[in-house]
């Protein structure tokens, strides 16, 4: 009687387990054929690649930029895999010799044949931006702008790509694309969650990151404030990106680039200097240089304080003091007279900061060779080490830096003020808010700056609405299927077990 | 579209000062300079002066130097030309028109009609 | 001052037919390959026009029967074919120079 009974629970155990095993394995069979098959496209991979120039005021860039074609609406796909500095000056310095211009262009024009294969040449399109320097060249002279555009645009079409045309873009789009990049970058127009991060500076939340971008000749800054409402319209973006919609303030304050912000400086000193000598703090201590009074008017950006000299020529001799050159960079911002509520400087509308930013080109440049990107380091200690760059002497500073060029090198006093000038009383960050400025050079191998995100516009890689993309996060798909897999991998071990040795397995079940 | 609207026509007596105001819109105000061009009736376009909208600075015609002031109100998109010390032959239509070196745009005139 | 000089002082064309005005600068108007020559329309009670810029450029939206040649000093409007519209006062001006400065102006009419 006790030998049937442990036969019949034998038998039903048996029947069970094999029951429930069969099941697992059937549904993980099916798992991982319904996450394979819906995650994968049974397509080769077909790299696509675009080229954007920026065409600055102090010099040229190249961008190579390449994606996977069937992830064209995906988020963070992009991504840059050359840049390519010109050999020279900005564009808007080529006014006087434009049949120079083919030159110019062709070793960085040349570097992107190379790399991007011939195969795809026709259908690479490349676009060039001109910014602040060709605004300022247009401003003078609409004639002369057209002039260099259409040299320029004439040297590009002579390549084997698809060139899309050549354009001063507003300060507006500088700043708008400026802050697509890195928010683009940083993956902050992903809806999904993230278990995890490889990207610096991200923090889990989808706020995105203001930008702040400094040029020679203009400087931006760009963020989505808390206040939706806007009292200057001419600031106010929207746009709807992956289904999801961004109120942006942005604004370019042409003329406060570093390149031209010291020539202001250097008009605005120079009409109360006695003789045509210019004791400037700006400078280091020994250092001496001569400046054309045309040279100082050619900008419009010194207009405003032009006046009849009774000397052609002034030399600099730097004294090196921070706290005088700060006072002096702080006479360049008008903050007496606001219209709004709040403004930056020079009656301009600035609504109140919100969030983090990523400041990069000559923000991240500069405050990198004065080894002060660091997050670790408080606006107090920035202050303390400026004061201490700038006074070092010129002739100590040259040994130093001896591989950095002496025109540059000069300069980092008076941009280093200049920036922490332009953060702290322009734009309004305090002590406090300056660990909310992130310095980026570049976002997991893309530079940050303009140039992506008009890329991104202009070839419609940023849809309005959330793309019907892979369900599933490569991070979840892997780890679905290794779960799925490792059911599958036990099923069939205890399947084993059970019908190879069923004594060893029932031993104990009486 | 670029638009520039000027303010209403103006009777002034010898001696007075006028103020001529030039709306911009349709582009960035601070993009492009702004020139004043004034024709009194019969006569040839003359060219007064510009201001650098971005920072107020300006550049005049001798003939006027002294008698004319060029500002703006970059909040409100606004030039304005002022005339001083105003004379019968001062009587004409005075333009606003945007441009570095070339005047593409132009507003509809103001009459101003110097008369004692 | 670049003094301009425009000639005719007036023109008579029958409808159809080609109208030349003629502006000379007092100097050269040419500047790093630019010629800083633009030409205008001014019908009565409206604001100039503009044509022709940098000598031979045309302005948005002018017809093609409007042409512009010349550099240095020497510079010429051609309306290829008149039209009852095209009367007018045409005004050459220079910008390569502070003070800007205008041609005396040409007066079309139809013959």
């Known amino acids: 009687m006790e030998d049937t009974k442990e036969s019949n629970v034998k038998t039903f155990c048996s029947k069970n387990i094999l029951a429930i095993l069969g099941f697992s394995s059937i549904i993980a069979v099916i798992a991982l054929l319904a996450v394979g098959l819906t995650q994968n496209k049974a397509l080769p991979e077909n790299i696509k690649y675009g080229i954007v120039l920026d065409a600055g005021s102090s010099h040229t860039s190249l961008y190579i930029y390449k994606w996977p074609a069937e992830k064209e609406n995906d988020t963070g796909v992009v991504h840059q895999v050359e840049e390519c500095r010109v050999k020279g000056p900005g564009i808007s310095k080529y006014v006087q010799k434009v049949n120079e211009i083919g030159i110019y262009l062709t070793d960085c024009m040349e570097r992107a044949r190379e790399v991007i294969p011939r195969s795809q040449h026709q259908e690479t399109p490349v676009y060039l931006g001109a910014t602040a320097g060709m605004r300022l060249l247009r401003m003078e002279s609409e004639e002369l702008a057209d002039r260099v555009l259409d040299v320029v645009e004439r040297s590009l079409s002579n390549y084997p790509f698809d060139f899309q045309g050549a354009r001063i873009i507003t300060g507006q789009e500088e700043g708008a694309y400026g802050w697509i990049t890195i928010n683009y970058l940083l993956g902050k127009f992903s809806q999904k969650t993230r278990w995890f991060s490889i990207v610096p500076y991200e923090t889990n939340n989808q706020e995105t990151f203001g930008a702040l971008d400094l040029g020679g000749a203009s400087t931006q800054i760009t963020f989505v404030p808390q206040n939706q409402t806007t009292e200057s319209p001419d600031n106010a973006l929207q746009f709807r990106l992956y289904g999801k919609d961004y109120n942006v303030y942005t604004h370019s304050f042409l003329c406060y680039g570093k390149d031209q912000a010291l020539w202001q400086k250097l008009a605005k000193d120079i009409q109360v200097a006695s003789n045509e000598i210019l004791r400037d703090p700006c400078f280091h201590p020994g250092y001496k240089k001569v400046v054309n009074v045309s040279d100082l008017y050619k900008t419009p950006c010194t207009k405003r304080f032009e006046m009849t000299l009774p000397f052609q020529q002034f030399e600099i001799q730097g004294i090196g003091n921070y706290q005088q050159c700060h006072q002096s960079v702080l006479e360049l911002f008008n903050t007496s007279y606001c219209p709004y509520s709040q403004c930056a400087f020079n009656g301009i509308f600035l609504p109140p900061l919100q969030g983090d930013f990523g400041a990069f080109s000559a923000f991240y440049f500069v405050m990198n060779f004065l080894n002060l990107t660091s997050e670790k380091v408080s606006q107090e200690k920035v202050t303390e080490m400026m004061k201490k760059f700038c006074s070092q002497p010129w002739e100590e500073i040259k040994t130093s830096y001896a591989g950095v060029k002496e025109k540059y090198l000069s300069e980092y006093c008076f941009s280093g003020t200049y920036i922490l000038s332009l953060l702290l009383q322009g734009y309004h960050f305090t002590a406090d808010s300056w660990e909310h400025i992130h310095f980026i050079g570049k976002i997991q191998g893309s530079d940050a700056g303009w140039t992506l995100g008009y890329m991104l516009n202009l070839t419609n890689m940023i849809p309005a609405e959330q793309p019907l993309s892979t369900p599933l996060s490569h991070s979840t798909y892997v780890f679905l299927m290794v779960l799925f897999s490792l059911v599958l991998v036990i099923v069939a071990i205890i399947g084993l077990l059970i019908f190879h040795k069923p004594s060893y397995f029932w031993k104990d079940m009486v | 579209q670029v638009q520039l609207v000027q303010s209403g026509a103006e009777v002034k007596k010898p001696g007075a000062s006028v103020k001529v105001s030039c709306k911009a819109s349709g582009y960035t105000f601070t993009d492009y300079n702004m020139h004043w061009v004034r024709q009194a009736p019969g006569q040839r376009l003359e060219w007064m002066g510009y201001i650098v909208p971005l920072n107020g600075g300006s550049t005049f015609n001798q003939k006027f130097k002294g008698r004319v002031t060029i500002t703006r109100d970059t909040s409100a998109s606004t030039a304005y030309m002022e005339l001083s010390s105003l004379r019968s032959e001062d009587t004409a239509v005075y333009y606003c028109a945007r441009g570095g070196t070339r005047f593409a745009y132009w507003g509809q005139g103001t009459l101003v009609t110097v008369s004692s | 001052d670049i003094v301009m000089t425009q000639s005719p002082d007036s023109l008579a064309v029958s409808l159809g037919e080609r109208a030349t005005i003629n502006c000379r600068a007092s100097?050269?108007?040419?500047?790093?390959?630019?010629?800083?020559m633009y030409w205008y329309q001014q019908k009565p009670g409206q604001p100039p026009k503009l044509l022709i810029y940098g000598a031979s450029n045309q302005g948005s939206g002018v017809p093609d029967r409007f042409s512009g040649s010349g550099s240095g000093t020497d510079f010429t409007l051609t309306i290829s074919s008149l039209q009852a519209e095209d009367v007018a006062v045409y005004y050459c001006q220079q910008t390569k120079e502070v003070p800007y400065t205008f041609g005396g102006g040409t007066k079309v009419e139809i013959k």
């Open positions: 100097e050269s108007v040419d500047n790093f390959g630019v010629s800083f």
